[in-house]
Interface confidence: low
């Protein structure tokens, strides 16, 4: 899977969309998780309704919400009040029993609020010592990592 970058402004909302094959994933719940390091586990943040037929209902964990258009095949994650510590790598997942298929790998980048006193060019990306707590963050800009870009920067 390529990594798709979603950029949002600090304090605002970011919407992450994860398209999928609605036939292949029919009947499956979905989840949004935060990647703990390059090869670490993906820590569950929020998942869709326990009853798949009610997946369209929005579910929240803190300021992260998830909803699933099971007919159209689009999982949408909304992250409100975006903060620097929300920057990092995430995954949209499709659940099947104890298995989890990755629908999309996502890099969330947090841009400084241009109305803030800080340099408007500030950009937070995940760091080695970043704590991986629940994400608190929805879509303004998205792109795929270019070939050759390193999704997880090497650690010293």
């Amino acid at each position: 899977h390529n990594t798709t970058v979603f950029q949002g402004v600090e304090g605002q909302s970011l919407q992450v969309s994860c398209p999928y094959d609605s036939m292949k994933h029919w009947g499956r719940r979905k989840a949004w998780c935060r990647q703990l390091g390059e090869k670490g586990p993906c820590q569950r943040v929020v998942s869709t309704h326990n009853l798949w037929l009610l997946s369209f209902l929005r579910r929240r964990n803190g300021s992260t919400a998830i909803t699933d258009d099971t007919l159209g095949g689009t999982l949408t994650i909304t992250l409100r009040n975006l903060q620097p510590h929300d920057a990092g790598f995430y995954q949209c997942q499709s659940l099947h029993g104890s298995e989890a298929d990755t629908l999309r790998k996502v890099l969330v980048e947090v841009l400084a609020d241009p109305l803030d006193h800080r340099d408007a060019g500030d950009l937070w990306v995940p760091g080695e010592s970043e704590s991986f707590e629940d994400a608190h963050v929805e879509h303004s800009i998205s792109r795929s990592l270019l070939e050759g870009e390193i999704p997880f920067p090497p650690t010293s």
């Epitope: 036939m23 009947g27 499956r28 009853l51 798949w52 298995e99």
Partner: antibody, heavy 123, light 112 residues
């Protein structure tokens, strides 16, 4: 109607590989999981793995990991199962089987099966 | 892996009489979406397996209504209300809630 037609019987030497084909017709091949199940003589059924032809996604039983490769050719609606490093214990009938879908939710049951391909491993 | 255990392993029944096969799984087969993916197959002599019951209690198309399935969680049952000569073969329960999919050892049904 749905049909799964498998390739003919094979006799193989220990250490060699075998590739069994399964040609599907009568349904949307790309959007249903295809499974491979084997049955040793006088024994029960054993699931080997599956493929989703639409994107090539596969899952394998741990027992066969590294020895089995399941592929699919969407252009010919054909699934393949290749088993390498054959040993006498691999002598079995190999079946392909499609996963049934029914709404709401997938049933994940194998509703149509191929006729089976007997693979005999003998020196 | 989920282990499926069937009882009895063989069954001899007089035509017209009922038959019952039990299947127990080593862990719950309730999927996170609320469905239970427990199925029953029949393999008649010299044939490929055929689907009888899917998701615990749903008869597959063309399956006579003398076949019924029930159960929940880890305990499931296949019942044949009146056995007929054409019902001979090996019955397998199977789960597809978790990968890898697994089958029971099979129950051989014979006619007395």
């Amino acid at each position: 109607q749905v049909q799964l037609v498998q390739s003919g019987a094979e006799v193989k030497k220990p250490g060699s590989s075998v590739k069994v084909s399964c040609k599907a017709s009568g349904y949307a091949f790309s959007s249903s999981w295809m499974n491979w199940v084997r049955q040793a003589p006088g024994q029960g059924l054993e699931w080997m793995g599956r493929i989703y032809p639409g994107d090539g996604d596969t899952n394998y039983a741990q027992k066969f990991q590294g020895r089995v490769t399941i592929t699919a050719d969407e252009s010919t609606s054909t699934a393949y199962m290749e088993l390498s490093s054959l040993r006498s214990e691999d002598t079995a009938v190999y079946y392909c089987a499609r996963l049934l879908r029914n709404q709401p939710g997938e049933s994940y049951a194998m509703d149509y099966w191929g006729q089976g391909t007997l693979v005999t491993v003998s020196s | 892996d989920v282990v499926m255990t069937q009882t009895p392993l063989s069954l001899s029944v007089t035509p017209g009489q009922p038959a019952s096969i039990s299947c127990r799984s080593s862990q719950s087969l309730v999927h996170s979406n609320g469905y239970t993916y427990l199925h029953w197959y029949l393999q008649k002599p010299g044939q490929s397996p055929q689907l009888l019951i899917y998701k615990v209690s749903n008869r597959f198309s063309g399956v006579p209504d003398r076949f019924s399935g029930s159960g929940s969680g880890t305990d499931f049952t296949l019942k044949i209300s009146r056995v007929e000569a054409e019902d001979v073969g090996v019955y397998y329960c199977s789960q597809s809630t978790r990968v890898p999919y697994t089958f029971g050892q099979g129950t051989k049904l014979e006619i007395k």
